[in-house]
Interface confidence: low
Amino acid sequence: IPVIEPSVPELVVKPGATVTLRCVGNGSVEWDGPPSPHWTLYSDGSSSILSTNNATFQNTGTYRCTEPGDPLGGSAAIHLYVKDPARPWNVLAQEVVVFEDQDALLPCLLTDPVLEAGVSLVRVRGRPLMRHTNYSFSPWHGFTIHRAKFIQSQDYQCSALMGGRKVMSISIRLKVQKVIPGPPALTLVPAELVRIRGEAAQIVCSASSVDVNFDVFLQHNNTKLAIPQQSDFHNNRYQKVLTLNLDQVDFQHAGNYSCVASNVQGKHSTSMFFRVVESAYLNLSSEQNLIQEVTVGEGLNLKVMVEAYPGLQGFNWTYLGPFSDHQPEPKLANATTKDTYRHTFTLSLPRLKPSEAGRYSFLARNPGGWRALTFELTLRYPPEVSVIWTFINGSGTLLCAASGYPQPNVTWLQCSGHTDRCDEAQVLQVWDDPYPEVLSQEPFHKVTVQSLLTVETLEHNQTYECRAHNSVGSGSWAFIPISAGAHTHPPDEFLFTP
């Protein structure tokens, strides 16, 4: 680290005095200090001498000696006061520029350390500082305004009390610049617009920024529109608003509108689409299939998307049968607005019961008329099976009835022993019935099929089982011939479904 002679942190001299500052280091050394007149510099290798024969108040300041070759970057400093009774302040700069929330140093250096107790900072013409101005003073550096605000952009003077009177420095202009985070913020209202030809419309483009220096314009299909601009300042932001009023819209007004704003940081733009239509419209659609199949006991949400202008005057869900005259509960119907002209309507059908199969219609109305969208809901059921023993045309026949949806397939099994259900080890024969007779097949109902197995003689130590299955599940019924007559076994609720 270089060494300064005289080896004192501060040196106080009178105007006209000779001052010699010597710096010695291991290698070459350099002086750094405030720009002031009358200094002479002598250097010889590892030492450097700064001297003046006629010190003035302008020589007041901190002089630093550095050793450029020192990897640790060490330095030494001495502060010189040139104590001029007529000049208590040495102002190093008359304009200071900072960004908001930075500390602003106003570099008025006190020429006499004795005066420190009576210093203050004022605005020019003796006006007091603004409220909430937080500042501190250092006789070596000057006044620091902490976390400067835009509103503190003013002309300041440093004041010192000398012989009972205040002596001012020359003025220092502080410019606090707003931190501009980016291009102006934009809003374009509405985000989408639909009007019938001849109706009125309004499009508002507004931009705001912390700084007043920005431009905003509205364009239609890439053509800049000449619209008077309204300006405002609130919430510490400058606002510029362009309002396009159309008394009677026509098709040439339709298209893309862009709101564009720019400043030094760049450009922002946002767009909307204006649609002009001949007359009111109402469109219903669904992303779902209009023919729905759901397993009994499960839930289903029916969703309808509505696009309409003007807005809806009425809407409701209706059950059209065929099972009962119940109507969907209002609490199960839900409406959500996606945007101004599009809505989604949902009907929730939790834990579907057999009587709830059928047609559900959504109806909506606006000045364009009524529209309806109808869903057909079929419930799926696992098969229910029963077997009886009968004689057909004199032949002993096992008759199996299976009902469910989708249509069940039927398989007959013959197995040894008396059992509720044939397992693989016991099976003697298996017959698939590829063409069971369909007994009933009405829309929204279960399909009932019948399968016949002609058995010339019933083997008494055997079980005949009818099994039916579909995509939902399976069901079975075991028939056990016993000497006192036939005996049947339903499944032990193994395939229970509500």
């Epitope: 199949e293 759901v294 397993t295 006991g297 499960e298 839930g299 289903l300 834990r351 799926r380 299955h469 995509s471 939902v472 599940g473 399976s474 032990d492 609720e493 193994f494 395939l495 229970f496 479904t497 509500p498």
Partner: antibody
Framework: QVQLVQSGAEVKKPGASVKVSCKAS????????MHWVRQAPGQGLEWMGW????????YCAQKFQGRVTMTRDTSISTAYMELSRLRSDDTAVYYC??????????WGQGTLVTVSS | QSVLTQPPSASGTPGQRVTISCSGS????????VNWYQQLPGTAPKLLIY???QRPSGVPDRFSGSKSGTSASLAISGLQSEDEADYYC???????????FGGGTKLTVL
């Protein structure tokens, strides 16, 4: 033979989500409901809900509504259960179980989900 | 607090007969069938009895189930050391629209 193989143990932070998988083999995946049941450490069994792999329809216990999502991929015979907004009291072993609506005849080996900050 | 009520523990000596009770209400056991599950230490539960009294294949006939009104019970005769496990009853509940379990009974073979 029927087998249900579940994904491995998970450690999650409160507020996160977990997704447990259950791969079925040895039977027709779409022919049976897949249920999810959980068991907190040292506690009893708690039913969460079911999915019908055939239709994709789901139903879950009121306690879990809005937090649990059950899905399936029939092409790989796999059911999934996702639980969101996890809390420390969701720490449990989560089981998938094949069955009919009211009971479960085959169970997965279980997946331990630990929720800890 | 479980919807179905079971005693927390039960015990017996090898060869003995042990019964575990399960009490519910009209919306569950009263109107639906009861199922029983066995959970051996450190393993997943296993279906023991379905539809009140039916045994899946592979379950020994030492295990039997019964139901009366809003209560059900599981009986294990000829108790063996490998029966030491937790036993859970379960049923569908019409008002909760879901499966409900008992709190479980820890069976100890002395």
């Amino acid at each position: 033979q029927v087998q249900l193989v579940q994904s491995g143990a998970e450690v999650k932070k409160p507020g996160a989500s977990v997704k447990v998988s259950c791969k079925a083999s040895g039977y027709t995946f779409t022919g049976y409901y897949m249920h999810w049941v959980r068991q907190a450490p040292g506690q009893g069994l708690e039913w969460m809900g079911w999915i019908n792999p055939n239709s994709g329809g789901t139903y879950c216990a009121q306690k879990f509504q809005g937090r649990v999502t059950m899905t399936r991929d029939t092409s790989i015979s796999t059911a999934y259960m996702e639980l969101s907004r996890l809390r420390s009291d969701d720490t449990a072993v989560y089981y998938c179980a094949r069955g009919r609506l009211t009971f479960f005849d085959y169970w997965g080996q279980g997946t331990l989900v630990t929720v800890s900050s | 607090q479980s919807v179905l009520t079971q005693p927390p523990s039960a015990s017996g000596t090898p060869g003995q007969r042990v019964t575990i009770s399960c009490s519910g209400s009209s919306s569950n056991i009263g109107s639906n069938t009861v199922n029983w599950y066995q959970q051996l230490p450190g393993t997943a539960p296993k279906l023991l009895i379905y539809s009140n009294n039916q045994r899946p294949s592979g379950v020994p006939d030492r295990f039997s189930g019964s139901k009366s009104g809003t209560s059900a019970s599981l009986a294990i005769s000829g108790l063996q050391s490998e029966d030491e496990a937790d036993y859970y009853c379960a049923a569908w509940d019409d008002s909760l629209n879901g499966v409900v379990f008992g709190g479980g009974t820890k069976l100890t073979v002395l």
